[in-house]
Interface confidence: medium
């Protein structure tokens, strides 16, 4: 997190806000609900209280405007700048302005007013942008999904550094951004994508360029807004320029940033029995056109060329790949070796000699 220079903050805990005007995109009650919910994000974790005024001067004046709207910080038409807010202080201090050239919504379409407002009110209270891609105060808008919003830990630490904690946090679970060098780090899925490596963990993935040590961290939804926050397994089919992503009983085919029509499909359409609830890991072999799909202590082999499950499967993981354990969290193949991830450990398995050749920490893939 980051606070503004000179640690700008309000010197009182009871703050007022006023909605000066409304966007035509939403009903008045939807707008009011979005702003109330956005203030609650911050009051839930601090001693701050927010009261709405219907007229007069409030600490935080909220308005919608376009282009030059009276503060010498003009908006720029659709997309680009969405909104801005002033840090705590008199006059403009704390005020939040929203660009009415955007389409404001209470859903994933256009820009979600609650999410943008919660971010802007962070500025109104004294938080600057964060470098943590998981933080609400990260400067890039990402719709985080329909489920109940949880304020990330980085933002909680930031706002409590200014105002301290509240009496009781109604939602004490604040998602932390994974630390790639945490020795207990386990991974959810790994796939190549157009020469890069994508390493998935929780609602994030690390993007590793070849010959590069520093992996970039992204929210999965910043790449693929339609995907679930978390995924179970992934593999690339390079000759078709596709990657396949699995979550629960569904899977998606993606070409770059775009989901193919007809997806998601059910994993049962691949020939998996109905009792398989999820795929835990998947890896594709371009030379044979086969894909291994792991679930529980079993492995299936799918023929991507003929679109059928191979006979004699499922088989036990321990029988086909002795020594790697009875589950696989994530897997990928490179230069004749399969890398199996099981908890905080990865096994380098030689396809040629059919045995484990190295055991390493899972996060050594991230150069830790």
């Amino acid at each position: 997190y980051n606070v503004f220079p000179r640690t700008l903050k309000w010197s009182k805990m009871n703050l007022t806000y006023r909605i000066v005007n409304y966007t035509p995109d939403m009903t008045h009650s939807e707008v009011e609900k979005a702003f109330k919910k956005a203030f609650k994000v911050w009051s839930d974790v601090t001693p701050l209280n927010f009261t709405r005024l219907h007229d007069g001067i409030a600490d935080i004046m909220i308005s919608f405007g376009i282009k030059e709207h009276g503060d010498f910080y003009p908006f720029d038409g659709p997309s680009g700048l969405l909104a801005h807010a002033f840090p705590p202080g008199p006059n403009y201090g704390g005020d939040a302005h929203f660009d009415d050239d955007e389409t404001w919504t209470s859903s994933s379409k256009g820009y979600n007013l609650f999410l943008v407002a919660a971010h802007e009110f962070g500025h109104s209270l004294g938080l600057d942008h964060s470098k943590d891609p998981g933080a609400l105060m990260f400067p890039i808008y990402t719709y985080t999904g329909k489920s109940h919003f949880m304020l990330p830990d980085d933002d909680v630490q930031g706002i409590q550094s200014l105002y301290g904690p509240g009496d009781e946090d109604p939602n004490p679970k604040h998602p932390k951004t994974p630390d790639k060098c945490d020795p207990s780090l386990s991974l959810d899925a790994i796939t190549s994508l157009r020469g890069e490596t994508m390493i998935f963990k929780d609602r994030f993935f690390w993007r590793l360029h070849p010959q590069q040590v520093d992996a970039e961290l992204f929210l999965t939804k910043s790449f693929w807004p339609e995907l679930p926050n978390r995924i179970d397994a992934a593999y690339e089919h390079p000759s078709h320029d596709l990657i396949f992503i699995f979550r629960g009983r569904k899977f998606w085919a993606l070409n770059g940033y775009d989901i193919l029509e007809g997806y998601p499909k059910k994993i049962s359409e691949l020939g998996l029995p109905k009792e398989v609830k999820k795929i835990s890991a998947a890896v594709h072999f371009e030379d044979t056109g086969k894909t291994l799909l792991f679930s529980g202590n079993q492995v299936w082999r799918y023929d991507d060329t003929n679109h059928i499950m191979d006979k004699d499967y499922p088989r036990l993981i321990e029988e086909d790949f002795p020594g790697i354990g009875d589950k696989v969290d994530a897997v990928y193949e490179k230069n004749g070796y399969i890398y199996f991830f099981n908890g905080p450990i990865q096994f380098e398995y030689s396809i040629w000699s059919n045995r484990i050749v190295r055991v390493m920490p899972a996060n050594s893939i991230l150069w830790c």
Epitope: P78, S79, I140, F218, S222, F223, N255, Y257, D258, L260
Partner: nanobody, 114 residues
Framework: EVQLVESGGGSVQPGGSLRLSCAAS????????MNWYRQAPGKQREFVAG???????NYAVSVRGRFTISRDNSEGTGYLQMNSLRPEDTAVYYC????????WGLGTLVTVSS
């Protein structure tokens, strides 16, 4: 419906630069990812670079560090700045919006030779 028209192709010597443009008609361009693909004579069409709606970029390994993709939603235009061109970059370059099942331009020829 989005129509795409590429321009900016031509002949250039190795080490030279070109800037390809992709003009989109239709106001929905900003709702789609924008990609460049290329096809060399006798070869399969291959991905070159992509930029998401949220302006996240992605490059083929062979062009990373030399090519830069960008977009201007207000103008409805996408760009591919190609520097340090090599003979193996010779191909017809196609603009795409929305991925393999999306919209395609007719292509513009880039020739790199001495």
């Amino acid at each position: 419906e989005v129509q795409l028209v590429e321009s900016g192709g031509g002949s250039v010597q190795p080490g030279g630069s070109l800037r390809l443009s992709c003009a989109a008609s239709g106001s929905t361009f900003s709702r789609y990812s924008m990609n460049w693909y290329r096809q060399a004579p006798g070869k399969q069409r291959e991905f070159v670079a992509g930029i998401s709606v949220g302006r996240i970029t992605n490059y083929a390994v062979s062009v990373r560090g030399r090519f830069t993709i960008s977009r201007d939603n207000s103008e409805g235009t996408g760009y591919l700045q190609m520097n340090s061109l090599r003979p193996e970059d010779t191909a017809v370059y196609y603009c795409n919006a929305g991925g393999l099942q999306g919209y395609w331009g007719l292509g513009t020829l880039v020739t790199v030779s001495s």
